[in-house]
Each structure stands twice: as C-alpha cells, then as structure tokens.
C-alpha cells in the first residue's frame, strides 16, 4: 500500500464515554490535524475509513458495521455508538484517502461503568462559581448533534446520588442548573441525565462535573503582603544563618497569574554573587484564595549582607505591591571584662 | 468525631407506623447523605433507602417505596426514617448511616433502634 | 436487583490463620463494592471500599480485591478482635445491596 501521513496516536484526546449510552465521537483529522473539513475533503472524493485495535491486542481490524440495530455506524465524520458496549474499549484509527492522498490518525476511547452515584474514572470537567455573586448557571455539556432540535429530551439533574428538585438555592431549569446565590455547600458533583427517544429506543446521556466555588470578583483586592512588615526586623550577626519569609495572600482571581519574587540590592537572587536559596510553599482557602510563603535564606551572613535591600514582590491581576524587610547587624554585647572596665576607668 | 445517635426503642402494634431518629454531630450535616439499613433478628443487612441532607430529596428501595418516608432537617442536623403499615417481619434494628452524597459507602452508623412490630 | 452471594457461610478459624472471604455478584459491579465487620450487639463497620481501599483507621491485615462479579476479602493474621460476621454490599446499581454475610467463628 502507497504511502500514509500517519499522525500516530493522539492521546491528547484521551476520550471516555459511558458504558450503555450513546456516544458521537468525531475523527480528530479535520478538527486538530488537517486544514479542511469533512465535506471539503468528501466533495474533493476522499472517503473515510475507520478501524480499530482492541484493548491488550495489536491487530488493527475492520469496524463492524453491520451489528444488530446499527450499533456502531459512519455518519459524515463522525462515528456513532448506540449504545457503547465495555469491550468498545481501545484505540480507534480514522483514515482519509483516495489514490493519491492519505492521512490518518489514531485515538484511545475508554468505555467507563459509572456507579449508582455517577462515580466512575471519567475526569470531570471543573466549573467555578463565584461565591454570593447572583444567579450563576451550569449547562449541561456535550449533548450538542445526540438529537434533532424536534426532540425535547428530559434532564434530570443529581448532586451525587441525588435528585435536584424544590431546592431554594438550586433549580433545575431544563440543560441549565441554575444557583440563586453560590454557597461552599455547594461544592460537589453535579450529573445531568438527559433522556430521549430515537427509532423507538430510549437512551440516556449522562454528563458530570464538578462544581467549585470560589471567591467573588466583588471581593477581590491586591496581593497583601503579610510578611515581611514593619513590625519584625531581622537582626543578625555575621556567620549566623538569614531568614525572612516572604508571606502573600492573592484573593481569587480567574485566569490571574500570582507570583511572588524577592529582589536583593534591585536584582533577582539569580543575578547576584551570594550564596541565597529561595523555597516557596503554597496553601489555598476553601474558596481558592491563595497564600504563597517564600522563605529567603542565605546559610552564613556576612556583615556586607546584613547592609544589602531585601524586598519581598508581589503580582496579580489586580496589581503589583512590594515590601522591604528590616535587616540589621547585630551589636554584639559589651564583654563585661574589658569594655565595661574600660567604661569604669580601670586601668 | 462524627456520631450519629439514634431514638430509642419501640413497640409497636401491626398497622401503625414508627418514626425512627438520627441526630449527627461532629461533621457538617448538610455535607453529607443519611441512609437507612436494617437488619431482621439473625439475619442480614437491607437498605431501605437514603437522602441528601442538603437538597431533602430521598432515593428509596423498591421494596419499601410507599410505606417508608425518609426526611432531614437541617436545622437540628437530624435525619427521620418513618414507616408506616407495620407488619410482624418489620421487626429489625433500623440503622442509620452518613455517606458522601456522591458515596456509596457508609463511613458511620449509629448505635442502631430495635422496632419491635407485635399485637 | 443484584444479588450478592458471599462464602462460605460460616469460616471456622484459630487466631493467627489466614481468612479469605469471598463475594460473587449476579451481574457486574466494577469495582463498586465495600466490605462490613458486624460485632454481636454492634453496628457494621466499614472495612474496605472501592473493592480495595481501606477505610480510615483499618488495620493493614485487612485486605480487598476483585473486580467485575468476583471479589475477596482477607485477612492476612487473624487477631481475636477479628471474629465476627462480615457482609459485602454493592453501590453500582439501585438498590444497593448486601451479601448475607460470612461468619467468621474461633476453631
């Protein structure tokens, strides 16, 4: 056989579906791969081919599609599964080509069993919510091309294993979920079943994700730097070992980018000669609100560091603020023997 | 630590109706489902159903769907179990026990109720 | 309904022997099943869940596997306190069901 442009295995689109419900799945070639879509391609007379190798074999064969009420079958790009079966487990190769010209790629589809609470190894998508911010809603994701706009399908919608109905605080409202006023109780997992017919059969789409409430733009400030502060100055003498922890608290922002740096003399530690190590350690709050610590620490002090700047940065998108620690030589103790004798007027 | 502590023991007559309690302490009630298991004298165990301490809707066993009513209150962080047509075999001890809302394991129970159904 | 069916009913055992417990499901639960001690007098306590997790506080003695229709439950080391009866219960399908239970009794 002529030569194939193979896009190897794309496990960037690592799909799982469920085990007994439908499932679409789109060959990645037009979507991420080529520069064309499927009916440019079909019209140019490509045809696309599927095939599949089993989970734990490496035999490539020819997708059935002549199973009992069409369970799996070919529409356009997309193949179709009604309903999945566990054993549809493995790795499915799409290829277009006719004479001339070929291009294929493979991708991993995993049927996963749920649990009577949805619990299964899906990864779930993560949506945040703002916490006492208004009415903020969820949609039902990833039912789009499963049925005809003619058909009113019915969703259900559970948090775990729980039926949403008559809540003050949620309401189901068709594919949207609705959340008057955001609360951490909120927090969990919330699975959409969505039911229509087709030819007769029922099917159910099931679609979890995982609902994370977070701290309100309302409420949001710049970093605030706990440490270092006016309060504490960090006296040392020479050959002793320097701490100063660096303490930033970054309210929640989404897509907002925290960092934290000290600058000793104007300069990152990187660009200087002494011998400095920076450790940073990061805790969150039940609403993501974060604290990062970076611990500065230079193991023997010289008395020309104890003369340097230690400024402790921070950034968000809400701003940039900056603090300089209290930094100091240590006078030493006046040895009694000789400076405070000396002080008396012994001789 | 979490506790769940349950109303005393009852007898009953055949055709009247219990009301079980289970009182949470040590966990946020609102956090977590309360399901309800009993167990005939010498035999095993049989769930009856569970509910979401947060949203108050109940999922039930076919067995007892209609004569079993399982609440929550949020306020006292106290879940119900009422059961109503008793007859001779509903003679068990009724236990409650706390699961996540998306678990299906029952991490605490409390002490058990026995309900004792004679005329 | 899923019926679990648990062996033997009864395991005739002296501390120190090793106790292997078996569930068999009528149809397939994944991994979505647990496992229960019961004390005379005493509520269940939970052992094992997700097939093979230990539930916080279990000793490593107690020990799950199995997946699909067949699982196991062991003991590596009976100690005295390990007498009693154990059930498995299942959480894939409504309703949740349990074993009849394994009665595990000093030799």
């Known amino acids: 056989s002529e030569r194939c442009d193979d896009w190897g295995l794309d496990t960037m689109r690592q799909i799982q579906v469920f085990e007994d419900e439908p499932a679409r799945i789109k060959c990645p070639l037009f979507e991420h791969f080529l520069k064309f879509n499927y009916s440019t391609a079909h019209s140019a007379g490509l045809t696309l081919i599927w095939y599949w190798t089993r989970q734990d074999r490496d035999l490539e064969e020819p997708i059935n599609f002549r199973l009992p009420e069409n369970r799996i079958s070919k529409e356009k790009d997309v193949l179709w599964f009604r309903p999945t079966l566990l054993n549809d487990t493995g790795n499915y190769t799409c290829m277009l080509r006719n004479t001339t010209y070929c291009s294929k790629v493979a991708f991993p589809l995993e049927v996963v069993q749920k649990d009577s609470c949805f619990n299964s190894p899906m990864k779930l998508p993560v949506h945040k919510l703002y916490i006492e911010y208004g009415i903020q809603r969820i949609t039902c994701p990833n039912v789009d091309g499963y049925f005809p706009s003619s058909v009113k399908p019915t969703i259900t919608w559970y948090m775990g294993c729980y039926k949403i109905q008559n809540f003050n605080n949620v309401i189901p409202e068709g594919m949207n979920l609705s959340f008057l006023i955001a609360l951490i109780s909120n927090n969990g997992n919330y699975t959409c079943v969505v039911t229509y017919p087709e030819n007769g059969r029922t099917f159910h789409l099931t679609r979890t994700l995982t609902v994370k409430v977070v701290g309100s733009p309302k409420n949001a400030v710049p970093p605030v730097i706990h440490s270092p502060n006016d309060h504490v100055v960090y006296e040392k003498e020479p050959g002793e070992e320097l701490l100063i922890p660096c303490t930033v608290y970054f309210s929640f922002l989404m897509d907002s980018r925290n960092e934290v740096w000290w600058t000793i003399d104007g300069k990152k530690p990187d660009d200087i000669t002494i011998d400095v190590t920076i450790n940073e350690s990061i805790s969150h709050s039940r609403t993501e609100d974060e604290t990062r610590t970076q611990i500065l620490s230079i193991k023997k002090v010289t008395s020309e560091d104890l003369k340097r700047s230690y400024v402790c940065h921070a950034r968000s998108a809400k701003g940039e603020v900056a603090k300089a620690a209290k930094v100091k030589q240590k006078v030493p103790a006046p040895r009694y023997t000789v400076e405070l004798a000396c002080g008396f007027g012994a001789t | 630590q979490v506790q769940l502590v349950q109303s005393g023991a009852e007898v009953k007559k055949p055709g009247s109706s219990v009301k079980v309690s289970c009182k949470a302490s040590g966990g946020t009630f609102s956090s977590y489902a309360i399901s309800w298991v009993r167990q005939a004298p010498g035999q095993g165990l049989e769930w009856m159903g569970g509910?979401?301490?947060?949203?108050?809707?109940?999922n039930y066993a076919q067995k007892f769907q209609g004569r079993v009513t399982i609440t929550a209150d949020e306020s006292t962080s106290t879940a119900y179990m009422e059961l109503s047509s008793l007859r001779s075999e509903d003679t068990a001890v009724y236990y409650c026990?706390?699961?996540?809302?998306?678990?299906?394991?029952?991490?605490?129970w409390g002490q058990g109720t026995l309900v004792t159904v004679s005329s | 309904e899923i019926v679990l069916t648990q062996s033997p009913a009864t395991l005739s055992l002296s501390p120190g022997e090793r106790a292997t417990l078996s569930c068999r499901a009528s149809?397939?639960?994944?991994?979505?099943l647990a496992w229960y001690q019961q004390k005379p007098g005493q509520a269940p306590r939970l052992l094992i869940y997700g097939a093979s997790n230990r539930a916080t506080g279990i000793p490593a003695r107690f020990s799950g596997s199995g997946s699909g229709t067949d699982f196991t439950l062991t003991i590596s080391s009976l100690e005295p306190e390990d007498f009693a009866v154990y059930y498995c219960q299942q959480g894939k399908h409504w309703p949740w069901t349990f074993g009849q239970g394994t009665k595990v009794e000093i030799k």
């Open positions: 149809q397939s639960v994944s991994n979505f």
């Open positions: 026990a706390r699961h996540l809302h998306n678990g299906i394991h029952l991490d605490y």
């Open positions: 509910i979401s301490a947060i949203f108050g809707t109940a």
